[in-house]
């Protein structure tokens, strides 16, 4: 079965030191428990988080993300997942790509994280 992968359309913002959540889902929604799901960072495809065979594959992570990420899978039965990144850093700013792979079929969606300096951040409004 074919599907599309949908991520946030607008950049997600986070402060250095905070945690941030990057949502990603497939449409039409379907159970993705048996799929491979992951996030990587272009252009060098550094692995941010990888979920395969029903387990998080920590050994494949880039060192700078080890211990800082968590895949929220509460709604994976509906094809919805969220990547949580803790202790956000300036170097986390930029593009992330989320993908779902079902056997040989893979689709992905790009998203952007904007990281702001908390020492100069002014609350909107």
């Amino acid at each position: 079965g074919q599907f599309r992968v949908i991520g946030p359309r607008h950049p997600i913002r986070a402060l250095v030191g905070d945690e941030v959540e990057l949502p990603c889902r497939i449409s039409p929604g379907k159970n993705a428990t048996g799929m491979e799901v992951g996030w990587y960072r272009p252009p060098f495809s550094r692995v941010v988080h990888l979920y395969r065979n029903g387990k998080d594959q920590d050994g494949d992570q880039a060192p700078e993300y080890r211990g800082r990420t968590e895949l929220l899978k509460d709604a994976i039965g509906e094809g919805k997942v969220t990547l949580r990144i803790r202790n956000v850093r300036f170097s986390d700013e930029g593009g992330f790509t989320c993908f779902f792979r079902d056997h040989s079929y893979q689709e992905e969606a790009a998203m952007e994280l904007k990281v702001e300096d908390p020492f100069y951040w002014v609350s909107p409004g």
Partner: antibody
């Protein structure tokens, strides 16, 4: 010319308290984050704490969290560090520095000695 | 926390020598790396920020390079006033951390 002048250091017994001050001049103090960095005798540099321009956001090293409090008074162009429950390992020269992550100007430092 | 490791911890050099100090981060920090110089009894002084940008007023014999995990501070021709201790610092996130320092001594 940017100037940062620390004061308030001295000898204190373990468990005691001290309040450090840093008087700033030569730049628009309220427009910059400020920090404290310390250096134990003969050792390297250790970041202690930083504070945002308005004072609403603060960050601390794990080694001082819950014991030290950073604050600022923009009307007086002054940065503070309230140090409570002092330990022998807090003995160091304490530097006031301009910036939150990159420190482009530093004061001359004030020595804090914690000893019985 | 991100660990910063400098090498060597000390070196002896002569005036006019080319000196290279390296700094390695325990994980990628992009280009969020600063270099400071400290002379005995004095406060540190910012030399280079963002891995390779020379701070205003710093002589051009100082240069920085690198990104990711490996960084270098180079003094192209050592001058008498350059004998000091040099520290790298990652400014990528909380907490910011420093290398242990490299002492440059007169040979």
């Amino acid at each position: 010319e940017v100037q940062l002048l620390e004061s308030g250091g001295g000898l204190v017994q373990p468990g005691g308290s001290l309040r450090l001050s840093c008087a700033a001049s030569g730049f628009t103090f309220s427009s910059y984050a400020m920090s404290w960095v310390r250096q134990a005798p003969g050792k390297g540099l250790e970041w202690v704490s930083s504070i945002s321009t308005s004072g609403s956001y603060t960050a601390y090293a794990d080694s001082v969290k819950g014991r030290f409090t950073i604050s600022r008074d923009n009307s007086k162009n002054t940065l503070y560090l309230q140090m409570n429950s002092l330990r022998a390992e807090d003995t160091a020269v304490y530097y006031c520095a301009k910036g939150g992550y990159t420190f482009d100007y530093w004061g001359q430092g004030t020595l804090v000695t914690v000893s019985s | 926390d991100i660990q910063m490791t400098q090498s060597p911890s000390s070196l002896s050099a002569s005036v006019g020598d080319r000196v290279t100090i390296t700094c390695r981060a325990s994980q990628s920090i992009s280009s969020y790396l600063n270099w400071y110089q400290q002379k005995p009894g004095k406060a540190p002084k910012l030399l280079i920020y963002s891995a390779s940008t020379l701070q205003s007023g710093v002589p051009s014999r100082f240069s920085g390079s690198g990104s990711g995990t490996d960084f270098t501070l180079t003094i192209s021709s050592l001058q008498p006033e350059d004998f000091a201790t040099y520290y790298c610092q990652q400014s990528d996130g909380n907490p910011t951390t420093f290398g242990q320092g490299t002492k440059v001594e007169i040979k």
